[in-house]
């Protein structure tokens, strides 16, 4: 997260760290007791590595009573996700067992009504991604509030040049932005999950390259079918 601040500890009990061989790889969001939603591209280079999900964490390194690392029983990328596009960049991870819920571990309601969030709406994005252009990784969860950007502006040639479909949304990126390592994490508007940070090699913090988020409402049928 660029231009953000440290989050209040455990105030986002839905927040997950998707880990590869014990190290933070991507963000994720607990959407059901046994399911974490993240980004498909996160596992592209995972190959034979061990994928796990950390819940109930604020610090990645310090012991915390609510922290627990779960093995992944099943990883379900969206069937239409592809390495070279940002489209359908969703991944559902089934935990090896139902998460132990409590004040620091709780699923987040997700948007089912397929309607765009109004431009200008302030939404919260959180993650353990890099906090500066030098690539410094934080130990504790960071967050930032970002205004939603209208799709027409996001589709301008100097922004994302027509790449933003109806299944994607954008948020402003003027020094405050999601960045590498935040992919798969939640964009929360009004207490509801609206978007998932897409994973790509997008430049962060440049106002002409807005953050791109997958609209979960557009994938309600797929999410429901996997969780069923």
């Amino acid at each position: 997260i660029l231009g953000g601040r440290e989050a209040e500890a455990h105030a986002r009990p839905y927040m997950a760290s998707v880990q590869l061989n014990g190290a933070h790889l991507c963000g994720g969001v607990l959407v059901a007791e046994q399911w974490v939603l993240s980004a498909a591209h996160c596992l592209e280079d995972a190959a034979d590595g061990k994928v796990q999900v950390l819940l109930g964490a604020h610090s990645l390194s310090q012991p915390e009573p609510s922290k627990r690392l779960y093995d992944v029983l099943r990883a379900v990328p969206h069937p239409d996700s592809q390495p070279d596009t940002i489209d359908h960049d969703l991944l559902l991870l089934q935990l090896s067992e139902k998460a132990t819920l409590g004040p620091a571990v709780r699923p987040l309601p997700w948007q089912r009504v397929d309607r765009d969030v109004a431009p200008g709406t302030l939404c919260d994005v959180a993650g353990w991604g890099i906090v500066n252009h030098a690539g410094r990784r934080p130990d504790s969860l960071q967050h930032v509030l970002l205004p939603v950007l209208d799709r027409a502006t996001c589709n301008r040639r100097t922004h994302h040049d027509g790449a933003i479909t109806e299944r994607l949304m954008c948020a402003e990126s003027n020094r405050r932005d999601s960045c590498k390592g935040d992919s798969g994490g939640p964009l929360v508007c009004g207490g509801v999950l609206e978007g998932v940070v897409t994973s790509g090699s997008r430049v962060c913090g440049n106002r002409k390259k807005p953050g791109i988020y997958t609209r979960v409402a557009s994938y309600a049928a797929w999410i429901d079918s996997v969780l069923a």
Partner: antibody, heavy 116, light 112 residues
């Protein structure tokens, strides 16, 4: 299939006004800026300006700012170009073109002739 | 405003010829996001322009591989490696990095 269809061109006297329409189909109208470009007979392409179909924000080439105005009817997925105080040198084919990707989609153009 | 100057203004060539059109801008067209929004359009008489190349060197969908773009800073080139009968048209360069966006004056490619 993305389609842009202009209409409203024709013969108009100097000093007169004309409103051109650009009807869009095959995509969500509010997801892309609309631009207007003109081409005088035998001449090159000239950018007039653009409009954001969500906010209505406009940007005009300084040469057109005083006399030309963009507007929208999102319920009809249509953009409009209102041209006032027309002169002989405004005689041209007028195109609308969607921005994103680049100017990949254009209307067929509508000819405006300013003559007495 | 940024001026784009194309050369030549017109040229005569035969089918199979290699054709090069240059476009020079009056100032750099590198955008503040680091990208260069230099595009090439082809226009045939009585028709709307067609996008050929975007961001200097990227071919638009369906554009034949004989069309290529190159350049940086202020100097750009469109090359047609082997001219085909359907390529006789007018070509325009365009910069979208700075408002007002501008077109070159055009290069007409005629049959020899």
């Amino acid at each position: 299939e993305v389609q842009l269809v202009e209409s409203g061109g024709g013969l108009v006297q100097p000093g007169g006004s004309l409103r051109l329409s650009c009807a869009a189909s095959g995509y969500t109208f509010t997801d892309y800026y609309m631009n207007w470009v003109r081409q005088a007979p035998g001449k090159g392409l000239e950018w007039i300006g653009d409009i954001n179909p969500v906010t209505g924000d406009t940007d005009y080439n300084a040469d057109f700012k005083r006399r030309f105005t963009f507007s929208l009817d999102t319920s009809k997925s249509t953009a409009y170009l209102q041209m006032n105080s027309l002169r002989a040198e405004d005689t041209a084919v007028y195109y609308c073109t969607r921005e994103g990707p680049s100017f990949a989609y254009w209307g067929q153009g509508t000819l405006v002739t300013v003559s007495s | 405003d940024i001026q784009l100057t194309q050369s030549p203004s017109s040229l005569s060539a035969s089918v199979g010829d290699r054709v090069t059109i240059t476009c020079r801008s009056s100032q750099t067209i590198v955008h503040d996001n680091g990208d260069t929004y230099l595009e090439w359009y082809q226009q045939k008489p009585g028709k709307a322009p067609n996008l050929l190349i975007y961001k200097v060197s990227n071919r638009w969908s369906g554009v034949p591989s004989r069309f290529s773009g190159s350049g940086s800073g202020t100097d750009f080139t469109l090359t047609i490696s082997s001219l085909q009968p359907e390529d006789f048209a007018t070509y325009y360069c365009f910069q979208g990095s700075h408002v007002p966006v501008t077109f070159g004056q055009g290069t007409k490619v005629e049959i020899k």
